[in-house]
Amino acid sequence: AMDLILINSLPLVSDAETSLTCIASGWRPHEPITIGRDFEALMNQHQDPLEVTQDVTREWAKKVVWKREKASKINGAYFCEGRVRGEAIRIRTMKMRQQASFLPATLTMTVDKGDNVNISFKKVLIKEEDAVIYKNGSFIHSVPRHEVPDILEVHLPHAQPQDAGVYSARYIGGNLFTSAFTRLIVRRCEAQKWGPECNHLCTACMNNGVCHEDTGECICPPGFMGRTCEKACELHTFGRTCKERCSGQEGCKSYVFCLPDPYGCSCATGWKGLQCNE
């Protein structure tokens, strides 16, 4: 199976350098990795082509670095795609303004079919305006200005695969660049099930690993490996066989790891927060 990892360094964009790094551990170079803008998730983002370069620190990796460019050029949804033997694996992620009026509770949220779900956005700026919520760019919900809570929520009592997508929140007087984004991933199967008919029982994935609905395999969080994610990697390492290393001075600080669906994005062990720097 492919080992593809997308590192979203600082998904909340300010005036600091920000990057995307897509790593394919041990792949041969004639199976190229691509990084692009995910217009399916967010149509109205910047259309300038990305300057994708080889990551010199790794054998098979591509990188996009924004050095203090205008945030409007960065704000949006992205993907990294790898192909092997005709099969494509795509990892999705997002970058948004640190100065957004709301911030998501998490960058991605993975739930099982039928789950009772609350998608949450934290109010950062207080304004005398209605709050509005969109899904994949289409309006779904508004909250009158005097009723906007500190935590703005979208409630889905029985999540279905069609509920999956990019949810965004902003004040009604705002725009794309003052919006907060979070991506809801809904597994095709109910909890602990996998297979075309969802009638196979998942292996119990440990350490917050996620059962893949098509293969029944555990997708392990960064920093864990093994069939059930039972083995902890050495400090500051990640990847299916723990061969990749975080090169930062503080290890995996500010590394938001995004893995193929249905996993989504998370921090390495020991880090938390939207930026994985807490």
């Epitope: 945030a71 725009n175 794309l176």
Partner: antibody
Framework: EVQLVESGGGLVQPGGSLRLSCAAS????????MHWVRQAPGKGLEWVAG????????VYADSVKGRFTISRDNSKNTLYLQMNSLRAEDTAVYYC???????????????WGQGTLVTVSS | DIQMTQSPSSLSASVGDRVTITCRSS???????????LDWYQQKPGKAPKLLIY???NRASGVPSRFSGSGSGTDFTLTISSVQPEDFATYYC?????????FGQGTKVEIK
């Protein structure tokens, strides 16, 4: 200070051309759609043209379609209106206006320039 | 094109009066979500217009609470609850549902 400053207005003969500029400052210019609105002497407001934040969407009033061209240079924080085949009825104060949106949808113009007068007369 | 008709075309009021201006559109401005695609602007002689209300009833930043927008579909109202000396100006409604964006002909509010 957030401001828009128009320039390029003046007296021009019918059939002539003029290029208006609008210099933006105090806000992130390429986060927003921009518009031109005009007002003939003693008359009401008339929307002329609009352009989205990344120039991906451009729209015109029927009265200027084919004669006027709206454009923007985000690297210079400047909006333009190229006006060709000018007519007497194009005589007006031309305002540039900032939208609150990045796209040409749910528009509202929260910042306006002081206006530049275009007079078309022989 | 959507036609916008304001009434009255002018009115006289005293400081402290409640002033109501109406705007009617030739087709509904109510979008699929509950917002109406209508803005209100104030313009003083020799000055640029100023945004007061957007999406029917949302007050723009810094606009005093005495200004309010209401209505839905094709009939809209701008209300100044207690008119102040600085409010004497011309007011315009504008529809933003479809291009071309169109303004009403204006309502001039004068001192009685």
């Amino acid at each position: 200070e957030v401001q828009l400053v128009e320039s390029g207005g003046g007296l021009v003969q019918p059939g002539g051309s003029l290029r208006l500029s609008c210099a933006a400052s105090g806000f992130t210019f390429d986060d927003y759609a921009m518009h031109w609105v005009r007002q003939a002497p003693g008359k009401g407001l008339e929307w002329v043209a609009g352009i989205s934040w990344n120039s991906g969407s451009i729209v015109y009033a029927d009265s200027v379609k084919g004669r006027f061209t709206i454009s923007r240079d985000n690297s210079k924080n400047t909006l333009y209106l190229q006006m060709n085949s000018l007519r007497a009825e194009d005589t007006a104060v031309y305002y540039c206006a900032k939208d609150i949106r990045e796209q040409l949808v749910e528009d509202a113009f929260d910042i306006w320039g002081q206006g530049t007068l275009v007079t078309v007369s022989s | 094109d959507i036609q916008m008709t304001q009434s009255p075309s002018s009115l006289s009021a005293s400081v402290g009066d409640r002033v109501t201006i109406t705007c009617r559109s030739s087709q509904s401005l109510l979008h699929s979500h509950r917002y109406n695609y209508l803005d209100w602007y104030q313009q003083k002689p020799g000055k640029a217009p100023k945004l007061l209300i957007y999406l029917g009833s949302n007050r723009a930043s810094g606009v005093p609470s005495r200004f309010s927008g209401s209505g839905s579909g094709t009939d809209f109202t701008l209300t100044i609850s207690s008119v102040q000396p600085e409010d004497f100006a011309t007011y315009y409604c504008m529809q933003t549902l479809q291009t071309p964006l169109t303004f009403g002909q204006g309502t001039k509010v004068e001192i009685k």
